[in-house]
Interface confidence: low
């Protein structure tokens, strides 16, 4: 016997309370596949999140971050404040890199300057808060037949792995009940 719900296309759900009629997904919900018995809530791009792609009856909304913030996590689950080059984001906001460290991006942490002497090289160009040092050639590099030396491009900050911040709430008055009322899913820092 064929499941009557299998005839319900994407954008609808099989409504058990109406004799398994294929009902359209209500506003702000979607079903991306046929035969679904529920529609999923559309992601709401609110606050620091910005809508990159509107939700439709068959696909979820996609968010990115407003200017001055950048995405973190799978599917842009969080927005983190941008800092200037030469700074890093701390719990107290953007702070200048300490002496001996640099950050050449608007995100990420300050990293130590390269230690040229570890490779037997000298410092050709001093480091700044925004740039790594440039190491000069070692004596071996200048021996006959050596390749020409070009300063290395500054190392790029590796991509952030998804981070999960947890807001811990206890008891009945958790302040999260509005999720079930307004059906908003937002990141609150």
């Amino acid at each position: 016997l064929q499941d009557p719900c299998s005839n319900c296309p994407a954008g609808t759900f099989c409504d058990n309370n109406r004799n398994q009629i294929c009902s359209p997904c209500p506003p702000n919900s979607f079903s991306s596949a046929g035969g679904q018995r529920t529609c999923d809530i559309c992601r709401q791009c609110k606050g620091v999140f910005r809508t990159r792609k509107e939700c439709s009856s068959t696909s979820n909304a996609e968010c990115d971050c407003t200017p001055g913030f950048h995405c973190l996590g799978a599917g842009c689950s969080m927005c983190e404040q941008d800092c200037k080059q030469g700074q890093e984001l701390t719990k107290k906001g953007c702070k200048d890199c300490c002496f001996g460290t640099f950050n050449d991006q608007k995100r990420g942490i300050c990293r130590p300057w390269t230690n040229c002497s570890l490779d037997g090289k000298s410092v050709l160009v001093n480091g700044t808060k925004e740039r790594d040092v440039v190491c000069g050639p070692s004596p071996a590099d200048l021996s006959p037949g050596a390749s020409s030396v070009t300063p290395p491009a500054p190392a790029r900050e590796p991509g952030h792995s998804p981070q999960h911040h947890h807001h811990h709430h206890g008891g009945g008055g958790s302040g999260l009940n509005d999720i079930f009322e307004a059906q908003k899913i937002e990141w609150h820092e």
Partner: antibody, heavy 123, light 112 residues
Framework: QVQLVQSGAEVKKPGSSVKVSCKAS????????ISWVRQAPGQGLEWMGM????????VYAQKFQGRVTITADESTSTAYMELSSLRSEDTAVYYC????????????????WGQGTLVTVSS | DIVMTQSPLSLPVTPGEPASISCRSS???????????LSWYLQKPGQSPQLLIY???RRFYGVPDRFSGSGSGTDFTLKISRVEAEDVGVYYC?????????FGQGTKVEIK
């Protein structure tokens, strides 16, 4: 249709920690919540907390605050419940369940449950 | 926390006869959006719980129409119009109108 498949039974010593996984297969992972519910032998159901897989925040019952950590990895469609400082009274079957705050059906209810993971705490 | 109290705790039933389980909450479950998130679950022996009813009275997919829910505010009832042998197990009510979610202590339904 979505299924929730949990990790296998565990035997733990008092004072240690246990981490139970719950993998979703066959559907969206990021648009609903995962709750964890436990059931001690011969007892009723007790809600421990919930997590939203993409937003990353978790809500915990006061009783477990500080001892439980609920997380999710959207890339593998897996939720985790870690309980620390285990004692004998934590011996129970631990269930994950899909918790749906959606417009149509069903709201504020657990429509899909994992098969349960028995955690035995014994010295 | 909201306390959910079920009665009776044990219910011997005769197949074909009706059965009724009561669930009371320690405070109103009507949420600010005028919704009441009260659901009912059946846990058959050796199985995970399964959803029967949500939002007081809405039957979940595949649940036979002999199951019905009713109530409002703080008093809720699950009725089985004609009990069948497969209906045995422990029935739980649960509120999700506020955190933390809380369950009733369960009602064990068994055949006489």
């Amino acid at each position: 249709q979505v299924q929730l498949v949990q990790s296998g039974a565990e035997v733990k010593k008092p004072g240690s920690s246990v981490k139970v996984s719950c993998k979703a297969s066959g559907g969206e992972f990021s648009n609903y919540f995962i709750s964890w519910v436990r059931q001690a032998p011969g007892q009723g159901l007790e809600w421990m907390g919930m997590v939203h897989p993409i937003e990353g925040w978790a809500v915990y019952a006061q009783k477990f605050q500080g001892r439980v950590t609920i997380t999710a990895d959207e890339s593998t469609s897996t939720a985790y419940m870690e309980l620390s400082s285990l004692r004998s009274e934590d011996t129970a079957v631990y269930y994950c369940a899909r918790d749906r705050p959606v417009f149509c059906c069903p709201r504020g209810a657990f429509d899909i449950w994992g098969q349960g993971t028995l955690v035995t705490v014994s010295s | 926390d909201i306390v959910m109290t079920q009665s009776p705790l044990s219910l011997p039933v005769t197949p074909g006869e009706p059965a009724s389980i009561s669930c009371r909450s320690s405070q109103s479950l009507v949420s600010p959006g005028d919704n009441t998130f009260l659901s009912w679950y059946l846990q058959k022996p050796g199985q995970s719980p399964q959803l029967l009813i949500y939002e007081i009275e809405r039957r979940f997919y595949g649940v036979p129409d002999r199951f019905s829910g009713s109530g409002s505010g703080t008093d809720f009832t699950l009725k089985i119009s004609r009990v069948e042998a497969e209906d045995v197990g422990v029935y739980y009510c649960m509120q999700a109108s506020t955190f933390p979610r809380t369950f009733g202590q369960g009602t064990k339904v068994e055949i006489k």
